[in-house]
């Protein structure tokens, strides 16, 4: 914490300007009025403060706003945003996309993924849902940021907005996030023709259930190996050799390259070796001919 001193009369601050860069930390603490700072935040980013000086300014704002900064201040934080922790940001209520854009620009090139994720979360909470304008802002200013949101937050995306999401925006999404987004995409794209539908739904397929993958295998989609490898293990395991062959089409040869990686490895272990042999790829590890495998881990009959 900055040591408290009295401000010398000649150093009293009446406006936020460049003269402040010559103030020592102690002088800034003593002479800058927090309310004045908050009122003139729009000037701060144009002044080349050192990181140490920015620490003092942040301290002043923290004292003035212990419950979290108002959006009028947040909007003009500029490089002061780089000093914020996720805990600080969690106190904010942000509704303006201009504020979001400004802070996303500042964060570019800095290791601030936790802060950015928290900021986006606050915006979604503040706006009530992840609407089209918010998604458009994220995809434009922060590709991949969509996946920083929790499944709970993503559940507020209306299906009508899904069309604005690009494949690269989903690259870092995990299975739990795709579980939320996939059914929305399935609803959003359901009126498209088969080939157009597959192009649109492909980035979301990591959240698809087995029956949807089986249905795709009947539609000559020729799924690429990268997409196949992102399918849920649980969605792939029930597929037959014939279904996988139909699903992948000419890309089926890629199974050999991925033979040791999940979900291909796990799928191979569930297939009869003579069925695998029909692919002519030399895949090994299937159930030997004549063996009967009883899976007691799941109480189910084949349906």
């Amino acid at each position: 914490d900055v040591e408290r001193t009295t401000c010398p009369p000649e150093k009293e601050v009446h406006e936020i300007d460049e003269s402040l860069i010559f103030y020592k930390k102690r002088e800034l603490e003593a002479c800058v009025d927090a309310a004045l700072l908050a009122a003139q935040m729009d000037r701060v980013d144009a002044i080349p403060f050192t990181y140490e000086q920015l620490d003092v300014l942040k301290h002043k704002l923290d004292e003035l706003y212990p419950q979290g900064y108002p959006e009028s201040v947040i909007r003009h934080l500029g490089h002061l945003f780089l000093k914020m922790s996720p805990e600080d940001i969690r106190k904010w209520n942000v509704t303006s996309l201009e504020t979001l854009k400004a802070l996303l620009k500042v964060s570019k090139g800095h290791e601030m993924s936790a802060q950015v994720a928290t900021l986006i979360d606050r915006v979604v909470v503040g706006r009530g849902q992840l609407d089209k304008d918010t998604v458009d802002t994220l995809t434009a200013f922060c590709p991949g940021c969509l996946c920083s949101l929790s499944p709970e937050r993503l559940s507020s995306v209306p299906p009508s907005v899904i069309g604005a999401v690009r494949p690269q925006d989903l690259d870092t999404c995990g299975p739990r996030q795709l579980d939320v987004l996939y059914p929305k995409a399935r609803l959003a794209f359901q009126n498209m023709s088969g080939s157009e539908y597959f192009v649109k739904i492909r980035p979301f397929l990591g959240g698809a259930p087995t029956e949807d993958v089986k249905a795709l295998s009947q539609q000559n989609v020729s799924m690429d190996l990268a997409t196949f490898m992102k399918l849920r293990r649980e969605a792939v395991l029930p597929l037959t050799v014939a279904e996988v062959q139909k699903l992948l089409g000419p890309h089926v040869e890629g199974l050999k390259v991925e033979e040791q990686h999940s979900p291909v490895r796990d799928w191979i272990l569930k297939q009869r070796q003579d069925d695998l042999d029909t692919l002519g790829l030399g895949l090994q590890g299937g159930i030997p001919n004549g063996y009967l495998i009883l899976d007691l881990s799941v109480r189910e009959a084949l349906s």
Partner: antibody, heavy 122, light 107 residues
């Protein structure tokens, strides 16, 4: 042949929580989406919400604040909890399977349980 | 939410005759509409999806038509087992919504 069976108390007191379970037999719960639908006596059908085996859910905004749908893959079951019930929640509650095929890409139901009547009364 | 309205509320038709049931959506649902049949004390049974595609095992006398906001379920020659309540359901958007039902009774 996949079958669905609802189970739970037939009588719930006002302001309490209604709890129902649907057991899926003859197939894996992992392959589809599963829904709850209810029907008040002599009235139409109302979709409550669905769940995926991973736990991902979506529910009717009119009930969202009171609804929790959960899944237990080890038991091949999914459950409904509806809190703060009133007489208006008296209905036959059905669990149902969403058809789940991209070929017909739709959120409609090709398999239903027999339904269980839940009465809300003190 | 999309409101589905069915008409008439009750339809009286003689066995062997044709029955025509209507369903209207408050906004376009494209062809994302299903029809169900429900008999007393039973769960609904899927008849039609995609507005016009018969579900597995449904007799050819059941047919569906329409798109956008106006839909029709036609039963060409009524059998005794067809007298029941029929519901339409849209799946163009969440929440999924059903019509209030049309009761088809013997005249």
């Amino acid at each position: 042949q996949v079958q669905l069976q609802e189970s739970g108390p037939g009588l719930v007191k006002p302001s309490e929580t209604l709890s129902l379970t649907c057991t899926v037999s003859g197939g894996s719960i992992q392959n589809y989406y599963w829904s709850w639908v209810r029907q008040p006596p002599g009235k139409g059908l109302e979709w409550i919400g669905y769940i995926f085996y991973s736990g991902s859910t979506n529910s009717n905004p009119s009930l969202k604040s009171r609804v929790i749908i959960s899944v237990d893959t080890s038991k091949n079951q999914f459950s409904l909890k509806l809190s703060s019930v009133t007489a208006a929640d008296t209905a036959v509650y059905y669990c149902a399977r969403e058809v789940g095929r991209i070929a017909v890409a739709g959120w409609f139901f090709d398999l239903w349980g027999r339904g269980t009547l839940v009465t809300v009364s003190s | 939410e999309i409101v589905m309205t069915q008409s008439p509320a009750t339809l009286s038709v003689s066995p062997g005759e044709r029955a025509t049931l209507s369903c209207r959506a408050s906004q376009s649902v494209n062809a994302n509409l299903a029809w169900y049949q429900q008999k007393p004390g039973q769960a609904p049974r899927l008849l039609i999806y995609g507005a016009s595609t018969r579900a597995t095992g449904i007799p050819a006398r059941f047919s569906g038509s329409g798109s956008g906001t106006e839909f029709t379920l036609t039963i060409s020659s009524l059998q005794s087992e067809d007298f029941a309540v029929y519901y339409c359901q849209q799946y163009n958007n969440w929440p999924l919504t059903f019509g209030q039902g049309t009761r088809l009774e013997i005249k």
